[in-house]
Interface confidence: medium
């Protein structure tokens, strides 16, 4: 005789009575009404489970709570069921025995029969776990149901000192969703909160969770598929604040069906955006466009921002959304990268992209810009990365497509190719009217447009000039005069520690900034504008330094230990982290500070020159690195502005020393024997390079590197060029993570030191 | 001026080991990488072995790699290049050779300086 | 690794101008731009004449120049000169801290 193996089957879910109706002691599970109607309701459900089938293997049930409406119970029951037949009793199979017996004509005297009209429409069966009834319990003393009404904004209080879990039970009308708002109010917290499509917490059913209070997100949105939520609060230290601030809507369901005819332009047309966005989709989510394209010269583009698609087996669910593009299945992720999916155009009907939620678990809102362009030609002078659909630089000397493509099949690398021969010459002497191809084609063309490439400037009419790095060199080369606008940057002052570095004079590096926390120097930083300055990203990685409210910056500083007529100081209004930075692999280390009021530009304050997106940096060129950080590895900051010169290097030699940690936007400079380099507290101060014309031109921000000065590892920068884009896009006011808000949590400053 | 010496050079049957030495004198030693480039009879250069300044990277041509051992002295001035498992084909002149610009970061793979040479002769 | 790619022999009468080709592949001379032109005279040691594809060291007449298209390097002699008979190699860095020869060409300057 052997005994039959059961395993414990957990479901949850809700009925509706129709003959009885919600009343506010309902809704408390303390009250003498609670926990007698419960104790009713949990009977009828034990005698429904009981006079089916499914009665042999019933072991327990429970009542937890009731909601508004026709009275709606919510309940779980297990069932102990035999191994052989788990499978076959799945939530819709369970609901289908209850459905029958509660539209049955037998004669049974049971109360879901007699005292209770039980709506079998109205029935919900999910599938739970133990855990999830071990989670609700926990939660039973600090149970609150709400019911959320049309155009009500229900603030959701805070659990008390005594708990130390808390379960939210939101409903709303049927036809409307719940959308819940948490706001983080402290900046550093253990909370965990869970949201749940369902009444009660099962894991099945996650939406989300966050933990701790969140930089990422300081506020956050969150969609139930429908007029159920549950949330779920669970207090990580003893706290007499809450750390965050709840309130739910219940908001309608917003359609996302668009019919859409693009122009023949190849700029940005619009946007498509899951709804209510930014706001996290909802795991009902169904969104289908249809864009029509004006010729079949054109595909189209989409243009992600930190979400990127890609090829899933058919047998995997999309976990962070589905994509359905031309039959093509691909699947949604988030990453700290821009990415672009190219359609190319087979049909003149256009192109119908679906996209859906395929679980309960979501993520934030998705908006994507469509452009078109050109088929036969979709990179002009650029290369097609087909990895991530981006345009990026060709053979320019470093590796911008992951595979490494666009440095392949290069007849020259980071110089200029002879149209005669194809011999290869370095940029500088592009231009420089002195002849060095055969034919002189170096020299030719240099006072008119040419088609745009790698290191030809584009002017703002967005023509592009031959000659490299024309940017304020003294000479009009555009057209339109751009190339000497903005000008007023990049020349020294009154003159003319950083390891193994000498002393700064008065107003040798004006645009060098100190950016302190109460009077203690942190980080160094740049002047790029009268109300910008620029430092790294990595300076703000602690919670701690997260709020601009903390930093003070100075200008025209010489010494850290006191204060001379030359200096001025400022507080910080905005902060801006680059959304992409990662501080494991400190890409994108980039961060601007507005300033609280403009700066007046003297001798010893004024800014250093940003370099177009195609300046030429040339490996081997020397350029000069200033701040105050350590004069060796863990030693204090210095007291007077050092300065030191510093050799840039290639990036392959870079990415090899480094074993391929180097990133597109990271640049190396430094010496063979070390000695010469930034350290802890240069973070985010400026790599600058003075150009044949006098000025000095940004060309990256101290970031990282293995010790400070040591031999064989030189100094890592963030390469101003790589993220010129969006510094521009900032400053004019196009956004990028602002606020206080800051992305991720290294550093040389914090030198990223290891 | 500016001097490289090798000695250490000789004959040898296969299957034997030589040590050879290089002598630098008349610039900062240990500033630089420092190279082995060999010249058989008759034939052209190659590359036997390279060393930073500091011996924390080494490289080794294909032909050698598991037998030769580069190695330096900075306080003595003195480059080595321990030879094992020697092959009939590693008869040749060996030259030592610095690196261009010792100063700088990274190298430019450039001998500017070499010495004259001593000669390996492997044969039974 | 293997040998970059050089003509064995080259030649032209004094006064004009020759040129040596080097080719290697995509992973040295395509990929870095350290190319360097060494001349041998007989029973003498080698002496940098290029380096950087196309930088001279100082001493070397600028009757030497050096360039690259893809994976060939070039080296051009012009005005030709008795004393530029001579062996020439080239070599490349082919990355993982190697570098690599070419078989060499043997500059004849006739007449």
């Known amino acids: 005789y052997k005994a039959e193996v059961t395993v414990s089957q957990v479901y949850s879910g809700s009925l509706r009575v129709l003959n009885r109706h919600f009343s506010q002691d309902l809704g408390r599970r303390e009250s003498i009404a609670f926990r007698s109607e419960s104790a009713k309701a949990q009977k009828m459900l034990q005698e429904l489970v009981a006079s089916t089938r499914l009665g042999t293997y019933y072991n327990s049930s429970s009542v937890y709570s009731f909601g508004e409406g026709p009275l709606t119970c919510f309940f779980w029951f297990i069932l102990d069921i035999p191994e052989y037949q788990r499978l076959t009793l799945s939530p819709e199979v369970v609901r289908e025995l209850l459905v029958d017996e509660l539209l049955s004509n037998s004669s049974t005297l049971a109360s879901y029969k007699t005292e209770y009209e039980v709506d079998p429409e109205g029935l919900v069966i999910l599938e739970a776990s133990v855990n999830d009834i071990v989670v609700l319990n926990s939660t039973l003393g600090c149970y609150r149901y709400s019911y959320v009404n049309p155009g009500q904004v229900l603030p959701l209080k805070g659990p008390d000192q005594q708990t130390t879990s808390c379960l939210w039970h939101l409903q709303g009308p049927e036809d409307l969703m719940i959308k819940v708002r948490l706001e983080w109010t402290r900046v550093d917290c253990r909370d965990r909160v869970a949201m749940y499509d369902a009444a009660g917490p099962l894991e099945k059913r996650l939406i989300t969770s966050v933990y701790g209070c969140s930089r990422q997100e300081p506020v956050m949105e969150v969609l139930a598929s429908g007029s159920v939520m549950a949330v779920v609060w669970k207090k990580g230290m003893h706290s007499y604040y809450d750390p965050f601030l709840l309130s739910v809507k219940s908001v309608a369901f917003q359609d996302c069906q668009v019919n859409l005819t693009l122009e023949g332009r190849l700029d940005t047309q619009g946007f498509l955006r899951t709804p209510y966005y930014p706001s996290y989709y909802s795991p009902s989510t169904h969104c289908s466009w249809h864009l029509t394209v004006p010729s079949l010269d054109y595909g189209l583009a989409l243009w992600f921002d930190a979400y990127a698609l890609r090829r899933q087996k058919y047998n995997r669910l999309c976990t962070q959304g589905q994509w359905m593009i031309q039959n093509r299945r691909l699947c949604g992720f988030r990453t700290l990268q821009p990415y672009a999916e190219r359609i190319p155009m087979v049909a003149s009907d256009g192109v119908t992209i679906n996209f859906t939620s395929q679980i309960s678990l979501t993520g934030p809102g998705v908006q994507v810009y469509y452009s078109l362009y050109n088929q036969s030609d979709p990179c002009p002078g650029e290369f097609l990365c087909s990895v991530n659909g981006l345009c990026v630089p060709a053979c320019d000397g470093i590796k911008d497509c992951p595979n490494g493509l666009d440095e392949r099949n290069c007849v020259c690398r980071a110089m200029f190719q002879c149209q005669e021969d194809s011999t290869c010459i370095s940029l500088p002497r592009v231009c420089d009217r002195q002849p060095d191809c055969l034919n002189g084609s170096d020299e030719e063309q240099c006072q008119e447009g040419v088609p745009c490439g790698t290191f030809t400037f584009q002017c703002e009419d967005r023509s592009c000039v031959k000659k490299p790095n024309p940017e304020c060199d003294g000479q009009s080369d555009c057209r339109d005069g751009s190339d000497e606008q903005h000008c007023d940057c990049g020349l020294q002052g009154l003159s003319s520690r950083i390891v193994g570095g000498t002393v700064s004079s008065e107003g040798e590096w004006p645009w060098q900034a100190s950016l302190q926390i109460r009077g203690r120097h942190i980080c160094g930083g740049a002047l790029i504008a009268d109300r910008w300055v620029i430092t790294a990203a990595h300076c703000f990685q602690e919670d701690s330094m997260a709020s601009p409210k903390l930093w003070t910056v100075f200008l025209g500083k010489m010494r850290q230990n006191s204060r001379w007529p030359g200096e001025v100081s400022f507080k910080v209004s905005r902060l801006f982290l680059h959304p992409y930075h990662e501080e494991d692999s400190h890409d994108y280390d980039v961060a601007l500070l507005q300033l609280d009021h403009p700066v007046v530009y003297s001798a010893t304050v004024r800014p250093v020159c940003l370099p177009a997106r195609s300046h030429f940096f040339e490996p081997g060129q020397h350029c000069w690195i200033t701040g105050w950080g350590a004069q060796r590895e863990g030693g204090p900051v210095s007291n007077t502005l050092q300065k030191v010169d510093v050799q840039l290097v290639p990036q392959d030699l870079c990415s090899e020393a480094y074993r391929y940690q180097v990133s597109p936007r990271m640049l190396c400079a430094g010496y063979r024997k070390g000695k010469k380099d930034a350290c802890q507290g240069d973070s985010g101060g400026p790599l600058v390079c003075r150009e044949p014309s006098g000025r000095w031109f940004l060309a990256g921000l101290v970031s990282w590197g293995l010790g400070c000065g040591r031999p064989n590892f030189f100094g890592v920068y963030t390469r101003v060029t790589r993220v010129i884009n969006w510094i521009q896009q900032v400053l004019t006011g196009g956004g990028g993570s602002g606020g206080g808000g800051s992305h991720h949590h290294h550093h040389h400053g914090s030198h990223h030191h290891h | 001026e500016v001097q490289l010496v090798e000695s250490g050079g000789g004959l040898v049957q296969p299957g034997r080991s030589l040590r050879l030495s290089c002598a630098a004198s008349g610039f900062t030693f240990d500033d630089h990488v420092m190279y082995w480039v060999r010249q058989g009879p008759g034939k052209g250069l190659e590359w036997v072995s390279g060393?930073?300044?500091?011996?924390?990277?080494?490289g080794y041509a294909d032909a050698v790699k598991g037998r030769f051992t580069i190695s330096r002295d900075n306080a003595k001035n003195v480059l080595y290049l321990q030879m094992n498992s020697l092959r009939p084909e590693d008869t040749a002149l060996y030259y030592c050779a610095r690196e261009k610009d010792g100063d700088f970061y990274y190298n430019y793979f450039v001998m500017d300086v070499w010495g004259q040479g001593t000669t390996v002769t492997v044969s039974p | 690794q293997s040998a970059l790619t050089q003509p064995p022999s080259a030649s032209g009468s004094p006064g004009q101008s020759v040129t040596i080709s080097c080719t290697g592949t995509s992973s040295d001379v395509g990929f870095y731009n350290f190319v360097s032109w060494y001349q041998q005279h007989p029973d003498k040691a080698p002496k940098v004449m290029i380096y950087e594809v196309s930088k001279r060291p100082s001493g070397v007449p600028d009757r030497f120049s050096g360039s690259k298209s893809g994976n060939t390097a070039s080296l051009t002699v012009s005005g030709l000169q008795a004393e530029d008979e001579a062996d020439y190699y080239c070599?490349?860095?082919?990355?993982?801290?190697?570098?690599?020869f070419g078989g060499g060409t043997k500059l004849t300057v006739l007449g």
């Open positions: 060393i930073s300044w500091n011996s924390d990277t080494i």
């Open positions: 070599s490349s860095y082919a990355g993982s801290n190697k570098v690599v």
